[in-house]
Amino acid sequence: LQDPCSNCPAGTFCDNNRNQICSPCPPNSFSSAGGQRTCDICRQCKGVFRTRKECSSTSNAECDCTPGFHCLGAGCSMCEQDCKQGQELTKKGCKDCCFGTFNDQKRGICRPWTNCSLDGKSVLVNGTKERDVVCGPSPADLSPGASSVTPPAPAREPGHSPQ
């Protein structure tokens, strides 16, 4: 025998108190699948949370975080405080990045500036708390008399010595 409740669609529940009739989910509740014997209470996006998507009879509400915070975890289970660019969140709140580090986002940690010399390059633009350094050509390319952009050497045919 087929379970009569299996005929109840999403947005309804199988009401045992009414001979297993499919009843609509009450206000502020939902059922996302058919054949449910109860409806789930809608999530309420209050306090640090705000509503991104309203609850319907077939789907739960979705929350995000109020301005000044960003979501953490699946379904925005928690909110973390934003900081400004050039800062990171510490135990004592938002603090400026230390010299030699930067953060170009409102979240995350300060990261060290790129060390241009490791790639044999020079610093073209200095780093700030908000921005990484910009590496330029290698120091040898910037020696006196050398143009800042070295043109490619002309191709030589084999067996010809340079002039």
């Epitope: 209050k46 640090v48 975890g73 289970s77 973390e80 135990k91 004592k92």
Partner: nanobody, 128 residues
Framework: EVQLVESGGGLVQPGGSLRLSCAAS????????MGWVRQAPGKGREFVSA????????YYADSVKGRFTISRDNSKNTLYLQMNSLRAEDTAVYYC?????????????????????WGQGTQVTVSS
């Protein structure tokens, strides 16, 4: 056994100050996000403030922003709520709550279902 014990409530005149404390035991305090929730007579619960396990993230309801300050001392397993410029509408029972999850060291929640443990509450009455 987990315990949250609030103290510091009492009767204060409008404009006055109080400092609530919540002493925690029976769990790893620094891993838990904490919150202060109040309930006035005949009204629903209101999340007043919350703080992450590390203390870095704090949240305040608009109704208390600029007047209340939440803090925690993880070495003493204690949560605090400094309440200044108190108003008659701050009269309520204040509860502390503790909840943990993957992000509870850095994040906060104002969803009551997130919180695993609740204290018994302390009464704050603001009246002249």
């Amino acid at each position: 056994e987990v315990q949250l014990v609030e103290s510091g409530g009492g009767l204060v005149q409008p404009g006055g100050s109080l400092r609530l404390s919540c002493a925690a035991s029976g769990f790893t305090f620094s891993s838990y996000a904490m919150g202060w929730v109040r309930q006035a007579p005949g009204k629903g619960r209101e999340f007043v403030s919350a703080i992450s396990g590390s203390g870095g993230t704090t949240y305040y309801a608009d109704s208390v922003k600029g007047r209340f300050t939440i803090s925690r001392d993880n070495s003493k397993n204690t949560l605090y709520l400094q309440m200044n410029s108190l108003r008659a509408e701050d009269t309520a029972v204040y509860y502390c709550a503790a909840g943990t999850g993957y992000y509870s060291r850095v994040g906060v929640s104002t969803d009551p279902s997130f919180y695993d443990y609740w204290g018994q509450g302390t009464q704050v009455t603001v009246s002249s």
